[in-house]
């Protein structure tokens, strides 16, 4: 009778994580008597996966009735495969004895595990940035196998090109991680914008995973200020308004100064939202000009989102009472301690 051969017909087997892997092995002879063992890897550090003779291998089942003498099929099924199970598996015939001695090994079957990447997590900068600045976004996904993966960046559906991507580790591993950093230039219209990281992998069957970041969490659009004097409502009264336009986020505090002295401070509450996601707000003062002997310098000072204050001033002439005056008129004044000013916002 010809000498026993150990046949492993599959050079490689690919299995999705969580599924069972069937590793085929047959022998060509019933001689010699002795057990079959399965190992992962070769050499002295090989890992025992299954021993026909003894041991407890809860994830391994034999495909056929391997306890019988006439059996020549020693294929096994390994349940609940994880990326850690990847490797080359050898079916090895031993000759019965004390100890059992290795008689012949199969050529090996390489098990590769297809593991899905985790949902991409996109994170932006720690601090807000203003339009025209470039900010970095990172995207991370972990636990996938095989190593081949595609990552794309989009801003509002438009593919970005300024990014760098790394897949780790560089060498062989049971699973891999991807890390990508994209650079995005902010515009004033980006409050409603989204940055999307899209990951495509063989395990996803053409349905890529996406992670998103809203630029509303990253952008700060500083306000523009306009101070105007409205027509006289009643004799000796002037309505001065401060228009705060196109700001984001909403966090804003406004202070009226009269000749450099704080008149009133208020926090933006009833704002109006623009189509681009920015906000507008208006505050007004009703000034009783008859209470002033000299010209009044009114300043609208705005502190937005904790940033240094910006301001706009308006010079209110009290020597004559025209129906309307323009804003931002430069004028020297000594200031006034009289407080006959009323305010509001809207």
């Amino acid at each position: 009778e010809e000498e026993l051969q150990v046949i492993q017909p599959d050079k490689s087997v690919s299995v999705a994580a969580g599924e069972s892997a069937i590793l085929h092995c047959t022998v060509t002879s019933l001689i010699p008597v002795g057990p079959i063992q399965w190992f992962r890897g070769a050499g002295p550090a090989r890992e025992l996966i299954y021993n026909q003779k003894e041991g407890h291998f809860p994830r391994v089942t034999t495909v056929s009735e391997s306890t019988k003498r006439e059996n020549m099929d020693f294929s096994i099924s390994i349940s609940n495969i994880t990326p850690a199970d990847a490797g080359t598996y050898y079916c090895v015939k031993f000759r019965k004895g004390s100890p059992d001695t290795e008689f012949k090994s199969g050529a090996g079957t390489e098990l590769s595990v297809r593991a899905k990447p985790s949902a991409p997590v996109v994170s932006g900068p720690a601090a807000r940035a203003t339009p025209q600045h470039t900010v970095s976004f990172t995207c991370e996904s972990h636990g996938f196998s095989p190593r081949d993966i595609t990552l794309k960046w989009f801003k509002n559906g438009n593919e970005l090109s300024d990014f760098q991507t790394n897949v780790d580790p560089v060498g062989e591993s049971v699973s891999y991680s991807i890390h990508s950093t994209a650079k995005v230039v902010l515009t004033r219209e980006d409050v409603h914008s989204q940055v999307i990281c899209e990951v495509a992998h063989v395990t996803l069957q053409g349905d890529p995973l996406r992670g998103t970041a809203n630029l509303s969490e990253t952008i700060r659009v500083p306000p523009t200020l306009e101070v105007t004097q409205q027509p006289v409502r009643a004799e000796n009264q002037v309505n001065v308004t401060c228009q705060v336009r196109k700001f984001y986020p909403q966090r804003l505090q406004l202070t009226w100064l009269e000749n450099g002295n704080v008149s009133r401070t208020e926090t933006a509450s009833t704002v109006t939202e623009n189509k681009d996601g920015t906000y507008n707000w208006m505050s007004w003062l009703l000034v009783n000009v008859s209470a002033h002997r000299d010209d009044v310098k009114l300043t609208c000072q705005v502190e937005h989102d904790g940033q240094p204050a910006v301001s706009k001033s308006h010079d209110l002439k009290v020597s004559a009472h025209p129906k309307e005056q323009g804003s931002n008129t430069a004028a020297e004044n000594t200031g006034s301690n009289e407080r006959n000013i009323y305010g509001g916002s809207g």
């Epitope: 009778e1 019933l30 001689i31 008597v33 002795g34 057990p35 026909q52 003779k53 003894e54 391997s66 306890t67 019988k68 003498r69 006439e70 059996n71 019965k96 004895g97 004390s98 100890p99 059992d100």
Partner: antibody, heavy 118, light 107 residues
Framework: EVQLVESGGGLVQPGGSLRLSCAAS????????MHWVRQATGKGLEWVSV???????YYPGSVKGRFTISRENAKNSLYLQMNSLRVGDTAVYYC????????????WGQGTMVTVSS | DIQMTQSPSSLSASIGDKVTITCRAS??????LAWFQQKPGKAPKSLIY???SLQSGVPSKFSGSGSGTDFTLTISSLQPEDFATYYC?????????FGQGTKLEIK
């Protein structure tokens, strides 16, 4: 049903010969090592011989050169040719199948009695 | 040849008892050890192979353990049908050899 049935036992004089048979059924006979085991009355079990799948044979010193094991796979039959019989060979002879992957016995016949006496 | 020594040679026990029979080999036999049960006038019945593997159809009250030279057979709760003679056997190499037997009797 897996079954082994021995036959051929009987009374024989010392120095005589006897041929035992074991008829196998219910399994692929050619795929198993087959053994003979004997048991003298009131005594323990003694292994007598084996024939492997490939026809290789082994015997203990007590019967070597006197007993010959053989098989006929086409007939699903196992044989034990016993020559130069001695009084000490008196026993019940069982055939057994090395049915496990490691050749452990799993199935036994009911036995046949061999008596060597003058 | 490898000698197999069983102890005790005989053992008296009651229904429901747990009993242990030991078997010692004169040299290392790995775990190629089988246990058989034999009742008077009957052929032996295979119980355990490779020291601890139960033959098909054998109840789980029988268990075996050991490796190398020292082995045990344990019957967890004796029933009337368990009173018999028990043999161990090494089958690591020819000639296969048996222990002398342990007769389990009812007390």
């Amino acid at each position: 049903e897996v079954q082994l049935v021995e036959s051929g036992g009987g009374l024989v004089q010392p120095g005589g010969s006897l041929r035992l048979s074991c008829a196998a059924s219910g399994f692929t006979f050619s795929s198993y090592d087959m053994h003979w085991v004997r048991q003298a009355t009131g005594k323990g079990l003694e292994w007598v011989s084996v024939i492997g799948i490939a026809g290789d044979t082994y015997y203990p010193g007590s019967v070597k050169g006197r007993f010959t094991i053989s098989r006929e796979n086409a007939k699903n039959s196992l044989y034990l040719q016993m020559n130069s019989l001695r009084v000490g060979d008196t026993a019940v002879y069982y055939c057994a199948r090395g049915g496990s992957w490691d050749d452990a016995f799993d199935i036994w016949g009911q036995g046949t009695m061999v008596t060597v006496s003058s | 040849d490898i000698q197999m020594t069983q102890s005790p040679s005989s053992l008296s026990a009651s229904i429901g008892d747990k009993v242990t029979i030991t078997c010692r080999a004169s040299q290392d036999i790995n775990n190629y050890l089988a246990w058989f049960q034999q009742k008077p006038g009957k052929a032996p019945k295979s119980l355990i192979y490779t020291a601890s593997s139960l033959q098909s159809g054998v109840p789980s009250k029988f268990s075996g353990s050991g490796s190398g030279t020292d082995f045990t057979l344990t019957i967890s709760s004796l029933q009337p049908e368990d009173f018999a003679t028990y043999y161990c056997q090494q089958y690591v190499s020819y000639p296969y050899t048996f222990g002398q037997g342990t007769k389990l009797e009812i007390k």
